[in-house]
């Protein structure tokens, strides 16, 4: 204030944020601050976070004479102490028929046979544990596998010699290999029968299957 004007410390009040001014001398004042503020003119917000009670990785966010906890996604509540039920919030949290199981601070998926991963989205590679005979090709399926055999091999694991290789079926019959035992099966054309379709049959009889 200039020398020609009368200085009154509390007029106007220098106190901010709702602080009340009290004149303490001819040229001095004191601000009585509202809770949550400090400073000679109540200009400074008091940081309420130093003694915060945010738990489970919650981050303290200072307010005016209070604080809030910013919780990680798995937790909720004033101090991040309440578990979030992810199974309720995300009905499709587990894929491919997996069952959601809520846990403290997270959730887990119980996957059906053939699937794995946090959300059961990964098809288990059954070929990793398959015993297809060397030289054959393993094809992964859901909870199973199949072996693609090279020429001359047969069976579920391509571990058998293919009996059809020697063309045992005659008269243009169709030759198949029994995947269990590797033996040939001849599907005879009309008019023929027998293990290798070499026998004539009576008219009226249809196709014959013979196993050997």
């Amino acid at each position: 204030a200039g020398s020609d004007s009368l200085y009154v410390p509390c007029a106007p009040s220098p106190c901010v944020n709702g602080g009340t001014c009290r004149q303490t001398g001819d040229f001095t004042f004191e601000c009585n601050c509202l809770p949550g503020f400090e400073g000679s003119t109540c200009e400074r917000n008091i940081d309420d976070c130093p003694n915060h009670r945010c738990q489970n990785g919650g981050v303290c966010v200072d307010g005016v004479n209070t604080y809030n906890c910013r919780c990680p996604p798995q937790w909720t509540g004033q101090f991040c102490t309440e578990d979030v039920d992810e199974c309720l919030l995300q009905p499709n949290a587990c894929q491919n028929g997996g069952t959601c199981a809520n846990r403290n601070g997270g959730y887990g998926c119980v996957c059906v046979n053939g699937w794995s991963g946090d959300d059961c989205s990964e098809n288990i590679d059954d070929c990793a544990f398959a015993s297809c005979t060397p030289g054959s090709t393993c094809i992964d399926r859901v909870a199973s596998f199949s072996c693609m055999c090279p020429e001359g091999k047969a069976g579920l694991l391509c571990h058998l010699d293919d009996a059809c290789i020697s063309n045992p079926c005659h008269k243009g019959a169709l030759c198949d290999t029994n995947p269990l035992n590797g033996q040939y099966i001849c599907t005879c054309p009309q008019g023929y029968k027998g293990a290798d379709c070499t026998e004539d049959v009576d008219e009226g009889n249809s196709h014959h299957h013979h196993h050997h």
Epitope: G39, N45, I46
Partner: antibody, heavy 120, light 107 residues
Amino acid sequence: EVQLVESGGGLVQPGGSLKLSCAVSGFTFSDFYMEWIRQASGKGLEWIAAQRNKANDFSIVYSASVKDRFTISRDTSKSTLYLQMNSLKTEDTAVYYCSRDGGRWGLDAWGQGTLVTVSS
Amino acid sequence: DIQMTQSPSSVSASVGDRVTITCQTSEDIYSGLAWYQQKPGKSPKLLIYGASRLQDGVPSRFSGSGSGTDYTLTISSLQPEDFATYFCQQGFKYPLTFGGGTKVEIK
């Protein structure tokens, strides 16, 4: 006229101690918050400590970088603010300023600064 | 701690130019911002407090504005004595934090 004059700076070895003083005049010392701020050569300003006014029991707050190593205090009878610096590190090398917190979010008076060099 | 992002870090200008410096805070500081001028080898000098209030004795070509997290210092017509480094500082809560500074240089 408000005046702040720092002294006590100098060369000190790492791990050593130094006490800075800030003599003030021209205002009622006990009515104001007082701050210490430092500035490394060619760098920005870094607040390091504050002592609140008498109405707030002269309570103290420190920055994380100096907490447990530096101590701020004042002697109202001598109108002097102090900064006791212990366990000094090379990164404490800077010009140290004392300033008056004028309220209303401004540091309205500063000393001329005193240079502290921490080196072996 | 409240982070202060000041830009630009330097600006080249001529006498008479209008210069604008900005300061962004990491959270709302409710206008609790000050601007300082510092010349080489000297201590900082308070220009603006409370985001927009001019400190006694500071020329009116300096002005401050802003609220929330965005603040601006404007020098309406640059004078030879204004070539210096300018800092913003939040006084809303401890620890007090400063911007990195803006050096105003002669073009």
